[in-house]
Amino acid sequence: QEGKFSGPLKPMTFSIYEGQEPSQIIFQFKANPPAVTFELTGETDNIFVIEREGLLYYNRALDRETRSTHNLQVAALDANGIIVEGPVPITIKVKDINDNRPTFLQSKYEGSVRQNSRPGKPFLYVNATDLDDPATPNGQLYYQIVIQLPMINNVMYFQINNKTGAISLTREGSQELNPAKNPSYNLVISVKDMGGQSENSFSDTTSVDIIVTENIWKAPKPVEMVENSTDPHPIKITQVRWNDPGAQYSLVDKEKLPRFPFSIDQEGDIYVTQPLDREEKDAYVFYAVAKDEYGKPLSYPLEIHVKVKDINDNPPTCPSPVTVFEVQENERLGNSIGTLTAHDRDEENTANSFLNYRIVEQTPKLPMDGLFLIQTYAGMLQLAKQSLKKQDTPQYNLTIEVSDKDFKTLCFVQINVIDINDQIPIFEKSDYGNLTLAEDTNIGSTILTIQATDADEPFTGSSKILYHIIKGDSEGRLGVDTDPHTNTGYVIIKKPLDFETAAVSNIVFKAENPEPLVFGVKYNASSFAKFTLIVTDVNEAPQFSQHVFQAKVSEDVAIGTKVGNVTAKDPEGLDISYSLRGDTRGWLKIDHVTGEIFSVAPLDREAGSPYRVQVVATEVGGSSLSSVSEFHLILMDVNDNPPRLAKDYTGLFFCHPLSAPGSLIFEATDDDQHLFRGPHFTFSLGSGSLQNDWEVSKINGTHARLSTRHTEFEEREYVVLIRINDGGRPPLEGIVSLPVTFCSCVEGSCFRPAGHQTGIPTVGM
């Protein structure tokens, strides 16, 4: 049968599985007269035979691992044994079968890993080989951890890359390995061929002993540093150490302080470089970083905590130059007159800021000294000996010593003796009626004036009136300001009124004095008044959740991609319809129900980014009120602009004839974004035919030089094509043309007879 198993002598390739006993011929070559017999030469290995009449066969099983390809030659001979045809190449490719098991290069491996090493970072490789064809599953190896000893809580601390045999820590291993608990582990690793996928795969195992070493790259304990140290600086306060020598250390101040008073040396010792002030900053948190010689971090940064310890370097300070209190003339012994609160900048709740109060002088000492008492630690002044009489002494001045453990400060207190508070404030009206206001009434508006009077001594705490809203305004939308001269109360709007949440409010006022009432006198109904606030609805425009909405997309997004969305709410709860305004480029559409914004045309960063449009939210129904917000679409660059010449280069010329080769410089640009390093263009001539006359050489990323290779140019214009590649992803190329004229020159300029003025070059080279 001509075709598959027989045919004329020609180059052929056959594929035969290894390991199979011969069961059929390879090929029957047909002789063309005058050829009568065939001869076989080449890598026969005494396996391949050709019979004289052209029958090619093999006589025993092949072994791919011995020879994967047998290169044979078959020639046809005439009756005299002379080659009349060929020899032609016959290639026998031996196809692989899985007849070799994988074997590890070592029966035992040893390695070490540092605790807290990065998960997934290999610290040891196991390696096996398989003589079978790696291009087939027969030689594709699959590594696995069979067992980890010890195994704690069924958690694997180690993992292996199934393809490469790289052993690394798992996340749990990185976090939990501790040489103090378990200094060594043993892994049994298996390797299978057939990519590990077949029941018929061969396998081998090896043992891996792993030592866990301590990671000394640890955050040190928090440091305490006393403020205002007078010791010579810098002072070593702590240290960090990388696991191996040669690390480069640095500190990172995450807080970006104007002055950062710490440094680190190349041993990893950390210093404070100047005295610290706790009152300026009481704690510092910064990071120590270890890098390799190339500046690459060796591990995560360590957090360093420095607490500044307080010393008593601040005296107490008085709340004001003179503190004024009032006391009623019939006030009883022990009554509180007021509290003097001094301050100390030293650390709170420590001895350094713990204050003592002591009265050092009373003037006048009438009717006696020691009329007042101050609580040593609280600073509360009390009446100590008897009730006071205004007509005898209307005012007392006290000098009070305030001290911490090292410093003393004098503070001054003035005590005014006032008439007794035996009259309550009385409202002129108990009901101020109804007041109707629109919900958009301005904040700060006075909406009502209320008045109470008090018959006690004018301009004292006994007659001064404070108005409080005690009912009906839990949101705190209203407030009352008091005129100190007239005790008139002005009810003002402090927060916006809201029809939707409080259409009617029943407000109750209370008028009271800052001074306590005398014993037996109580506030009664006369000190209370009410009014009803009715808020009317105002149809308010929808409110956007942001003034400006911003989104970021790649400029090459597909049409119809959602690029952002906006949200607005209507105070009355109506539906909202969204629309766009100012979409001058016609790039966007908005879903009028949801506010989602989609692209409807190709976007182009180079046309301008961000692209700004206005979004309008309109009430559906109601008064169709609307609000406007901004939508800014930031377009991220893709490399979609080929390089071009940076400017117009018409008018380049050389004076003819050239006395020596000349050159000119040109600049390229493109419209894509070039962050940090700028463009990196490469330049070449646009066609091979130009190479005899011109050469182009790169000067930098944007400029190149075009040079002549000889001086034998005709007197005419040459158009030189230049190929500029931007090296982007994907790389884009522009072919630009530089027109260069060779012309006769007069005084360094091109000379053209009259009538030939068109396109005169103006730049000489």
């Epitope: 959602k562 709860g573 539906d575 319809s577 009028h592 129900v593 949801t594 559906v620 129904g621 169709s624």
Partner: antibody
Framework: QVQLVQSGAEVKKPGASVKVSCKAS????????IHWVRQAPGQGLEWMGA????????SYAQKFTGRVTMTVDTSTNTAYMELSSLRSEDTAVYYC??????????WGQGTMVTVSS | DIQMTQSPSSLSASVGDRVTITCRAS???????LQWYQQKPGKAPKLLIY???NLASGVPSRFSGSGSGTDFTLTISSLQPEDFATYYC?????????FGQGTKLEIK
């Protein structure tokens, strides 16, 4: 009371167009968005698009863009949905529905459109 | 588009039973814009629950809704004869609005 009343059943040939009307009563059409939803025999509900009668703004499901047109006539308080280039798989009941805060609180009674050669 | 998948597609129950229908979204949905509708044969759908858990006007209190993110449920605490119908969830958190494929509730 508030209701939406739709036009009667239609039988159309493939390639033709159909225009279904939806008349609002008991409220003003411009007070709410109008949506169109269809339901093929024995199948679920499929949203086709919406129109804001106040200014004619609309949004259509991608599947129907280019074939559907939603309009309103505020003088007669009526919304319309026109579907062109009809094919047999457009055979369905077409509903109009009014939305408030994006939920469909009032529905028309439905219009059966049959597409058959 | 957000796909809404209801389960089960159909279920048989008896009067008085407590029934729960779930609706899972292919991506997160704002709970303000998740609705449930009831549809009886030959009739237009009827709004049952809006904004995940609010009962529409005139809907009996045995119906309730809950959920957030991608998982939502409709519960009927004690089935009545008039509750046998097909139930649909719908999202309008993002356009296009999409419905679940429906759950047919039949008498056992």
């Amino acid at each position: 009371q508030v209701q939406l009343v739709q036009s009667g059943a239609e039988v159309k040939k493939p390639g033709a167009s159909v225009k279904v009307s939806c008349k609002a009563s008991g409220y003003t059409l411009t007070s709410n968005n109008i949506h169109w939803v269809r339901q093929a025999p024995g199948q679920g509900l499929e949203w086709m698009g919406a129109i804001y009668p106040g200014n004619g703004d609309n949004s259509y499901a991608q599947k129907f863009t280019g074939r559907v047109t939603m309009t309103v006539d505020t003088s007669t308080n009526t919304a319309y949905m026109e579907l062109s280039s009809l094919r047999s798989e457009d055979t369905a009941v077409y509903y109009c529905a009014r939305s408030f805060r994006r939920y469909f609180d009032v529905w028309g009674q439905g219009t059966m459109v049959t597409v058959s050669s | 588009d957000i796909q809404m998948t209801q389960s089960p597609s159909s279920l048989s129950a008896s009067v008085g039973d407590r029934v729960t229908i779930t609706c899972r979204a292919s991506s997160s949905v704002s709970s303000s814009y998740l609705q449930w509708y009831q549809q009886k044969p030959g009739k237009a759908p009827k709004l049952l629950i809006y904004s995940t858990s609010n009962l529409a006007s005139g809907v009996p209190s045995r119906f309730s809704g809950s959920g957030s993110g991608t998982d939502f449920t409709l519960t009927i605490s004690s089935l009545q004869p008039e509750d046998f119908a097909t139930y649909y969830c719908q999202q309008y958190s993002s356009s296009p609005s999409t419905f679940g494929q429906g759950t047919k509730l039949e008498i056992k």
